[in-house]
């Protein structure tokens, strides 16, 4: 049966025994800046082009053992959430991956900047349809990373990022704090903000909306047919990147402002239990859970 | 995220160093009274001192970026410091990535075209 997260973002009309909006997102290219990925996993084979871009720091620790499946774990899962054949949101979207996170899931602001620059140069050399850039990463507030995101957004690129898993104000992190970026927090099957160990999803006025981010089934790099459940604001951001790809595929001329407005408009309102957030953040945090447009848009989204 | 907000630095540390016009014979001295700022991550364990993103003013051309990077290297060398230009940015932001001692920050902030300098820091999968 349909995984809870796909059911949650699907308009009631389409809640059959399976989630299959055919060819969703086919006009859109989604760039993923993350770890390396297992691009020939059955769930994503042929959908992800691994670029030759790689800018990662060395792994910490002298005894670190580089195991391919672990190196690929985070990125493979997210690629599956965005465009996987059976557990993906935008099954028609094509993706390009850039490696900016090492086998321990760590990268640098500078490496991310160079990755964003690579995307801009690719866009200039070979203009395609709408572009979505997924940044499933977070660091401390960075003026330069936010500035780069702003420039890329002004060039017509839609950037989607994780709010961060620090149970903190997202405005203290980048690229989550960049105003032009769509920043996504994580909720669970009960529409509660996601708790991750002692921490959890970030919140506050720098978050644009929430999306499913707990126990998300997706491609596992352990084997070519494996699936695994992962949690985090990265998974939430991947859902919104997929929804954005489907919206842009249906309406390629949408501006960033219009897309943001549509994401908010079609979100489920006031379903999140705000008691989880600090009192002073409740009024600032949007009570929105991302969803696809309803069946009135059948001809646009499900053709 | 969340359009319409004012830029907020939060705990972000910003060190403002006023440019002093007596810097050693710059051919293109900056406008009087302008300041370039230095930024670093507020979360200490995430800082990566020794690598810096030098961001130049918006209309700076690639050739000027390269020239500014070379000037920094030359001035650093005169002081006995080795530097390495790791990347020259163009396309999104003008600037360059440099590996150097933090001792050179004051010098770097006085270079022509410099808007601000940010110490590199870590980002993490979420």
């Amino acid at each position: 049966s349909i995984p809870w997260n796909l059911e949650r973002i699907t308009p009631p009309r389409y809640r059959a025994d399976e989630y299959q909006p055919p060819d969703g997102g086919s006009l859109v290219e989604v760039y993923l800046l993350d770890t390396s990925i297992q691009s020939d996993h059955r769930e994503i084979e042929g959908r992800v082009m691994v670029t030759d871009f790689e800018n990662v720091p060395e792994e910490d620790g002298t005894r670190f053992h580089r195991q391919a499946s672990k190196c690929d774990s985070h990125g493979t899962h997210l690629a599956g959430v965005v465009s996987g054949r059976d557990a993906g949101v935008a099954k028609g979207a094509s993706m390009r991956s850039l490696r900016v996170l090492n086998c321990q899931g760590k990268g640098t602001v500078s490496g991310t900047l160079i990755g964003l620059e690579f995307i801009r140069k690719s866009q200039l050399v070979q203009p395609v349809g709408p572009l979505v850039v997924l940044l499933p990463l977070a660091g401390g507030y960075s003026r330069v990373l936010n500035a780069a995101c702003q420039r890329l957004a002004r060039a017509g690129v839609v950037l989607v990022t994780a709010a961060g898993n620090f149970r903190d104000d997202a405005c203290l992190y980048s690229p989550a704090s960049a105003p032009e970026v769509i920043t996504v927090g994580a909720t669970n099957a009960q529409d509660q903000p996601v708790t991750l160990g002692t921490l959890g999803t970030n919140f506050g006025r720098c978050v644009d909306l929430f999306a499913p981010g707990e126990d998300i089934i997706g491609a596992s790099s352990d084997c070519s047919t494996c699936f695994v459940s992962q949690s985090g604001t990265s998974q939430a951001a991947a859902h919104v990147a997929g929804i954005a790809a489907m919206m842009l595929s249906a309406e390629p001329e949408l501006t960033l402002a219009e897309l943001r407005q549509r994401l908010i408009h079609f979100s489920a309102k006031d379903v999140i239990n705000e008691a989880w957030f600090p009192e002073d953040q409740r009024v600032l945090t949007p009570n929105l859970v991302a969803a696809l447009p309803p069946s009135t848009h059948e001809n646009l989204y499900f053709q | 995220g969340a359009m319409g907000q004012e830029d907020e630095d939060g705990d972000y540390e910003e060190l403002v160093l006023a440019l002093r016009s007596e810097e050693d014979g710059l051919a293109e001295a900056p406008e009087h009274g302008t300041t370039a700022t230095f930024h670093r991550c507020a979360k200490d364990p995430w800082r990566l001192p020794g690598t810096y993103v030098v961001v130049l003013k918006e209309e700076t051309h690639l050739s000027q970026s390269e020239r500014t990077a070379r000037r920094l290297q030359a001035q650093a060398a005169r002081r006995g410091y080795l530097t390495k230009i790791l990347h020259v940015f163009h396309g999104l932001l003008p600037g360059f990535l440099v590996k150097m001692s933090g001792d050179l920050l004051e010098l770097a902030l006085k270079l022509p075209h410099v808007d601000y300098i940010e110490e590199d820091s870590s980002v993490f999968a979420q």
């Epitope: 297992q38 691009s39 020939d40 059955r42 084979e45 691994v50 391919a68 070519s224 | -």
Partner: antibody, heavy 115, light 109 residues
Framework: QVQLVQSGAEVKKPGASLKVSCKAS????????ISWVRQAPGQGLEWMGW????????NYAQKVQGRVTMTTDTSTSTVYMEVRSLRSDDTAVYYC????????WGQGTTVTVSS | QSALTQPASVSGSPGQSITISCTGT?????????VSWYQQHPGKPPKLMIY???NRPSGVSNRFSGSKSGNTASLTISGLQAEDEADYFC?????????FGGGTKLTVL
């Protein structure tokens, strides 16, 4: 254009080993693995397994596990399948195909096992 | 014994429509979006006609369409033509592998 080119026909004795090659071109090799499928005379298609061009990982069908080894040589973009301890019921046309989706097929390699 | 069940043969006259069924279980056809259909002419390798239940690769005639309901997938060929005479195989993912149907011989009368 996307192409898979296989090695030529083979005649083998029972108990011998067989190695078929499949050279890929015209696409990003790491974006797809290679599946191997065989078809006995007048019969249907049988999936034998898959190998990753990205990391060499394999996924064998239970029926042939232990008797089949798939390998890859990334320097030449060539994938190999070796079948050991051949029997007469291994007589078939062996195909390589791109990925699990099998959207592009090789021309086939006819293998006859006979004493 | 193939994992997926197809009729051994179907036939139709030129211009007619025919449908070939492919029945599996909730562990294969019913559980995945990845049902494919292949056409095979004698002495030739199979050719992909439909992938992921209902998608046509570029170059394949729009006379070919696919659908799925529960554990059964179907291939429909409309406006039957002489060159459609061939064997047709369905395939599906399973949790760890791939399975094919036994094949259906299509005769154009």
């Amino acid at each position: 254009q996307v192409q898979l080119v296989q090695s030529g026909a083979e005649v083998k004795k029972p108990g011998a080993s067989l190695k078929v090659s499949c050279k890929a071109s015209g696409y990003s090799l790491t974006s797809y693995g290679i599946s191997w499928v065989r078809q006995a005379p007048g019969q249907g298609l049988e999936w034998m397994g898959w190998i990753s061009a990205y990391n060499g990982n394999t996924n064998y069908a239970q029926k042939v596990q232990g008797r089949v080894t798939m390998t890859t040589d990334t320097s030449t973009s060539t994938v190999y399948m070796e079948v050991r301890s051949l029997r007469s019921d291994d007589t078939a046309v062996y195909y390589c195909a791109r990925g699990y989706g099998m959207d592009v097929w090789g021309q086939g390699t006819t293998v006859t096992v006979s004493s | 014994q193939s994992a997926l069940t197809q009729p051994a043969s179907v036939s139709g006259s030129p211009g007619q429509s025919i449908t070939i069924s492919c029945t599996g279980t909730s562990s294969d056809v019913g559980g995945y979006n990845s049902v494919s259909w292949y056409q095979q002419h004698p002495g030739k390798p199979p050719k992909l006609m439909i992938y992921e239940v209902s998608n046509r690769p570029s170059g394949v005639s729009n006379r070919f369409s696919g659908s799925k309901s529960g554990n059964t997938a179907s291939l429909t060929i409309s406006g039957l033509q002489a060159e459609d005479e061939a064997d047709y195989f369905c395939s599906s993912y399973t949790s760890t592998s791939m399975v094919f149907g036994g094949g259906t011989k299509l005769t154009v009368l």
